[in-house]
Amino acid sequence: NKILVKQSPMLVAYDNAVNLSCKYSYNLFSREFRASLHKGLDSAVEVCVVYGNYSQQLQVYSKTGFNCDGKLGNESVTFYLQNLYVNQTDIYFCKIEVMYPPPYLDNEKSNGTIIHVKGKHLCPSPLFPGPSKP
């Protein structure tokens, strides 16, 4: 028995930040769970983890240097990624694991979300307008 996950097919991070919402076919209320976000087709990089427990406040962390935060809904976890680089444009997969109560449950692999990180467009400074036309 697997949890189904829905995510947006594509998101654009214009300001080097993005909210990625992972929607589950499962209610996380009063469950112990580990929600994670993985980068790459092979999900090789674990970008962010949200750990939830019925008796504790939500804990969010990244072991891989990403600046991330997380918010919990009844059937969703939203990952807020900041300070993204253009070269971190990639496909990102949501994963959910329910540790308690038994039995352990996890999700069918989702289709993922392509996050396209747009570089900040630097406007020319008025002090240095560039070469003037003849």
Epitope: Q59, M99, Y100, Y104
Partner: antibody, heavy 120, light 107 residues
């Protein structure tokens, strides 16, 4: 209270196998990894591998991948580490320890250790 | 694999001394560094997790600092029960690895 209780000392001949058990109590078995760490006489700590009882996924140190087998019996909250083709340099104290599955970075509770002696 | 290098490998100190042990990681492990104390014939005990957080029940004379590749364990005023071997361990990526240990002996 939270405890990890290991099986007793073993003496084995080279080439044989040994299976060490680790019985967990006082916590939710499926909320934690069980790790195995060994310490040769007078030496430091060496991580062998870990198993998550929830889905029985394992991670192994490459050095032990072909000789160590980690298993669990969730019905009795017990983890096992079997090491095959024993050599004299496998003589060590073998510890089980745990790390939280959701917050996995440190080992907060340890078993008392099981001495395994490999000698002809 | 991430290599963890501890120094010194041993040191002699007196009760009341301030003792500092360092641990170097072969690559950036951010704050995913833990410290353990081990006494002869016993299992290791967790002292510090995530570089600077004191584990429950550990005296406040123990403190940890650092991030990235360089970390420090400090015992502000050494007590008789602190004579032991100390290990660092990285919890950033598998395989988890330990430093070689630092034995703190009585001068």
């Amino acid at each position: 209270q939270v405890q990890l209780v290991q099986s007793g000392a073993e003496v084995k001949k080279p080439g044989a196998s040994v299976k060490v058990s680790c019985k967990a109590s006082g916590y939710t078995f499926t909320s934690y990894y069980i790790h195995w760490v060994r310490q040769a006489p007078g030496q430091g700590l060496e991580w062998i591998g870990c198993i998550y009882p929830g889905n029985v996924n394992t991670n192994y140190n490459e050095k032990f991948k072909d000789r160590a087998t980690l298993t669990v019996d969730t019905s009795i909250s017990t983890a096992y580490m079997e090491l095959s083709r024993l050599r004299s340099d496998d003589t060590a104290v073998y510890f089980c320890t745990r790390s939280h599955y959701g917050l996995d970075w440190n080992f907060d509770v340890w078993g008392q250790g099981t001495t395994v002696t490999v000698s002809s | 694999d991430i290599q963890m290098t501890q120094s010194p490998s041993s040191l002699s100190a007196s009760v009341g001394d301030r003792v500092t042990i360092t641990c170097h990681a072969s690559q950036n492990i951010y704050v995913w560094l833990n410290w353990y104390q081990q006494k002869p014939g016993k299992a290791p005990k967790l002292l510090i997790y995530k570089a600077s957080n004191l584990h429950t029940g550990v005296p406040s004379r123990f403190s940890g600092s650092g991030s990235g590749t360089d970390f420090t364990l400090t015992i502000s005023s050494l007590q008789p029960e602190d004579f032991a071997t100390y290990y660092c361990q990285q919890g950033q990526t598998y395989p988890y690895t330990f430093g070689g240990g630092t034995k703190v002996e009585i001068k």
